[in-house]
């Protein structure tokens, strides 16, 4: 019997009946055994087929078989109801071998030419299975020349049988207080040959409760207890199960904080598995009762281990633990059934005693000493000499613990000194130099420091003066001896003030004329305002209307008098404003350089002379009455004049303050 070629040589060839293409003889029997490599099959087809036709091919035939199975018995030329001829059919071996038998009987009614066939080895696609047959692989099948292999989806591993996919279902740990777990693929059939371990591990103090839900279907046996697939539940106290079948197991109260669930499956079966919903319980903590003026959140029917609540106070109340304020409060239930922190109190917010208001006072409106939430206090300033700036002085104790004004300010109101108050009443006439009386010029400041000079009080901690009067002390402000509240230059009874800083106008050049002859002194402390110490007002925008030519201003100081000595008593003089061109012309002739009088100056005095400020008055204020506000304001600062004070045809020259309002305001606001 001829054999096909041995592999690994190519397996292919031709078969033919004896004598082909001539007729075959009687009583012939030929057998060919073809063998392909493992993983291959043989393909055979006929290019010529002409055999005697007989009932069920009993006479002459070609029989194809593979192993024990007969694939076909062929005869004739074309197929009939009971006989088969190959026609264009292709035949395949079931394995890697194919037997071909040719037989002719003792006679032929007419000559038949037999057959010619060709064969070849080809790869078997093991992944192709007939309908109804079990798949080659559990998950994925991969064909290749001479064989195949299986692989698994993520979460599975190939079993050692190389076909089954076992679930990678161990090592899952559930730590939440409740959750769900199920057999792999639930509710689809669970995988074969798997061993699953699930752990529920909660904090000590919790007890796990297991409920089987929806459906339960695990392969069982009518006589033996769960011999194939089973589910077991293990705690540190006891074991539950094994479970199998179709009945939902009852709830399991484990009384344990750790549970191990084991699920084992064999190689067969088609069952949907199980699903467990687990919850937990613990010893409850005492129900939290909210403190007065507070509430608990969240509100629960009971609070067990790890549950927490917070306390929130009503508006106007604050959390206190003992006497200490808490930003927030949260208590956590512990495993022994106690809360980890004691309940706080919601205590009414207390704004505390209000701060003292300099030059003012505070009055309790709600009740004596009441400083709690919504209490009202009223600040007011000392009458006559101070006025309240910013707000109306009414403050309420708000929920944030601050006294707050009706405008929402938390800072104190400011008692600002009233400016421009004087005891003096003026007529329209020009008087000679006269002694000042108490309260006439309460803004008058005496400046000692090398020479005698003057200044005017602004607010309660600034002095306005001439730059030339304090130029020498600009770098040694503390050397200035500043006195106020007195009429007598040499009196021991005065209010002492000291300088913190001296600000000389940046446009002033010493010994080069008197343009920009203006300076400010910042006092190191605020002075107390009274009838003898009151600031002068700064000019309003409209002040020019009270400073026209021939309007009367008043200069005051302790400067030289007609006798040639410094005045012992504060003196003052009422003098008219002089036309600017007239004044400029008066100082155009020698010994005065051209341009001595600038637009930053104003002149005052009599053409006939006799009334003037003089040395020692420098820096003092030339003041005017604002008839609308009935307050005095500073229009000029004593600056310079003729060598001989009060000389006819010459005038006193004063720094024009209204030109310097922005400069003054900037210095004061910045420092």
């Amino acid at each position: 019997t001829p054999l096909g070629p041995k592999w690994p040589e190519p397996v292919f060839g031709r078969l033919a009946s004896p004598g082909f293409p001539g007729e075959y003889a009687n009583d012939q029997e030929r057998r060919w055994t073809l063998t392909a490599p493992p993983g291959y099959r043989l393909r055979l087809y006929f290019t010529h087929f002409d055999l005697e036709l007989s009932h069920l091919c009993e006479y002459d035939f070609v029989k194809l078989s593979s192993g024990a199975k007969v694939l076909a018995t062929l005869c004739g030329q074309e197929s009939t109801d009971t006989e088969r001829a190959p026609g264009k059919d292709t035949f395949y071996s079931l394995g890697s071998s194919l037997d071909i038998t040719f037989r002719s009987d003792y006679s032929n009614e007419k000559p038949f030419t037999g057959f010619e066939a060709f064969y070849a080895a080809e790869d078997i696609d093991e992944c192709q299975v007939a309908p109804g047959e079990a798949p080659t692989c559990d998950h994925h099948c991969h064909n290749h020349l001479g064989g195949f292999y299986c692989s698994c989806r993520a979460g599975y591993v190939l079993h050692r049988n190389k076909r089954t996919c076992s679930a990678l279902c161990s090592g899952q740990v559930f730590t939440q207080r409740s959750g769900e777990l199920s057999s792999p693929e639930y509710p689809r059939p669970y995988p074969k040959l798997s061993s699953c371990t699930y752990s529920i591990s909660l904090e000590e103090g919790f007890s796990v409760i297991l409920d089987f839900v929806e459906s339960f279907d695990v392969e069982t046996h009518p006589e033996t207890l769960c011999p194939y697939d089973f589910l077991k539940i293990q705690t540190d106290r006891e074991e539950h199960g094994p479970f199998c079948g179709k009945t939902l197991p009852h709830r399991i109260e484990t009384k344990s904080n750790t549970v191990t669930i084991t699920f084992v499956t064999d190689e067969s079966g088609d069952h949907t598995g199980w699903k467990i919903h687990y919850t937990s319980t613990a010893q409850p903590c005492p129900y939290p009762m909210a403190p007065p003026n507070g509430h608990v959140s969240p509100v629960q029917a009971k609070y067990i281990l790890k549950d927490s609540f917070s306390i929130f106070c009503e508006t106007g109340y604050e959390l206190l633990q003992g006497h200490l304020p808490l930003k927030s409060f949260t208590a956590v239930c512990q495993k022994d059934g106690s809360w980890d922190r004691p309940m706080p109190a919601c205590s009414i917010v207390d704004c505390g005693p209000p701060d003292d208001l300099p030059s003012g006072r505070v009055e309790y409106i709600t009740g004596p000493g009441v400083t709690t939430y919504k209490a009202v206090i009223q600040y007011s300033c000392e009458e006559t000499f101070y006025t309240m700036k910013v707000n109306d002085g009414k403050y309420v104790c708000e929920a944030d613990g601050f006294w707050t004004s009706s405008k929402g300010e938390k800072s104190l109101p400011v008692c600002e000194p009233v400016c421009g108050l004087s005891a003096r009443t003026t007529g329209g006439r020009i008087y000679g130099g006269q002694k000042a009386k108490p309260g006439d010029f309460p803004w008058q400041v005496l400046i000692l420091g090398g020479t005698t000079a003057a200044g005017a009080l602004l607010y309660d901690n600034w002095v306005l003066t001439a730059a030339h009067a304090v130029y020498e002390q600009k770098h040694d402000a503390s050397a200035l001896d500043i006195r106020m509240g007195t009429l007598k230059r040499l009196s021991p009874h005065y209010t002492q003030a000291w300088s913190e800083a001296v600000f000389i106008h940046e446009g002033y050049t010493h010994d080069a004329g008197f343009d920009n002859d203006i300076a400010l002194i910042k006092l190191n402390n605020k002075v107390v305002i009274n009838s003898n110490i009151t600031p002068i007002c700064l000019p309003r925008k409209e002040a020019e209307s009270f400073m026209r030519t021939d309007d009367i201003g008043t200069a005051s100081g302790w400067g030289l008098t007609q006798r040639g000595f410094l005045a012992r008593n504060l003196m003052y003089v009422d003098i008219p404003i002089v036309d600017h061109q007239k004044c400029t012309a008066a100082y155009e002739k020698p010994p005065y350089p051209r341009g001595s009088v600038t637009a930053n100056m104003l002149c005052a005095g009599l053409e006939s002379g006799g009334k003037d400020s003089c040395r020692g008055d420098s820096g003092g204020a030339l003041v005017f009455l604002d008839s609308e506000t009935e307050r005095w304001f500073v229009g000029g600062i004593v600056s310079w004049g003729s060598m001989n004070c009060g000389e006819a045809g010459q005038y006193g020259v004063y720094t024009k303050v209204i030109n310097y309002i922005p400069w003054i305001e900037n210095i004061i606001s910045d420092f």
Epitope: H323, P325, S347
Partner: antibody, heavy 118, light 106 residues
Framework: QVTLKESGPVLVKPTETLTLTCTVS??????????VSWIRQPPGKALEWLAH???????SYRTSLKSRLTISKDTSKNQVVLTMTNMDPVDTATYYC??????????WGQGTLVTVSS | QPVLTQPPSLSVSPGQTASITCSGE??????AYWYQQKPGQSPVLVMY???QRPSGIPERFSGSNSGNTATLTISGTQAMDEADYYC?????????FGGGTKLTVL
């Protein structure tokens, strides 16, 4: 005007007991939410809270020194007393008493330097 | 006892902003307090309950506290602000201080 003043020995021997007195004025030890705290500061080191007492007589101590500390108050004398037993050279520090209000230690005494040495 | 951690030192130029931090576990859930101490002097409370300024403390001092960090910010730092700064918080009725930050104004 709130003031607090510490008084007590400037030198103590090891193993002895330190008694410090804080005399307060300008606020009451018997009403409101005020408290008095003792804080110490070893030379060149940080502040270290020791104990406090409130108007309600609620007391609290530093955990690590609890067994050695006692705080008390005498409302009639406006005084708070701290005793510290078994003194050791490492307890050398400036000891401050201070007022607690709204959780903040808002007024402090000038402090008293206590040296522990044999 | 919980620990409050501060940087040991911080240097700023005059006029610059200084931010001093204090960190501790869940510090933002508690109130933070800040103290200034100049050499040879007692400490002074400069900030209470995270961001409240006691009267007399300049507006350039501000505070914040969230998460694990409280911050004291001094905007427009001046030479007079050179000092040691300590943070403090209350934990179960006991006070805890930070190790202090030495602020140097260059």
């Amino acid at each position: 005007q709130v003031t607090l003043k510490e008084s007590g020995p400037v030198l103590v021997k090891p193993t002895e007991t330190l008694t410090l007195t804080c005399t307060v004025s300008g606020f009451s030890l018997s009403r409101g939410k005020m408290g008095v705290s003792w804080i110490r500061q070893p030379p060149g080191k940080a502040l270290e809270w020791l104990a406090h007492i409130f108007s309600s007589d609620e007391k609290s101590y530093r955990t690590s020194l609890k067994s050695r500390l006692t705080i008390s108050k005498d409302t009639s004398k406006n005084q708070v007393v701290l005793t510290m037993t078994n003194m050791d050279p490492v307890d050398t520090a400036t000891y401050y008493c201070a007022r607690i209000r709204a959780g903040g230690i808002d007024y402090w005494g000038q402090g008293t330097l206590v040296t522990v040495s044999s | 006892q919980p620990v409050l951690t501060q940087p040991p030192s911080l240097s700023v130029s005059p006029g610059q902003t200084a931010s001093i931090t204090c960190s501790g576990e869940k510090l933002g859930d508690k109130y933070a307090y800040w103290y200034q101490q100049k050499p040879g002097q007692s400490p002074v409370l400069v900030m209470y309950q995270d961001k409240q300024r006691p009267s007399g403390i300049p507006e350039r001092f501000s505070g914040s506290n969230s998460g694990n960090t409280a911050t004291l910010t001094i905007s427009g730092t001046q030479a007079m602000d050179e000092a040691d700064y300590y943070c403090q918080a209350w934990d179960s009725s006991t006070a805890v201080f930070g190790g202090g930050t030495k602020l140097t104004v260059l």
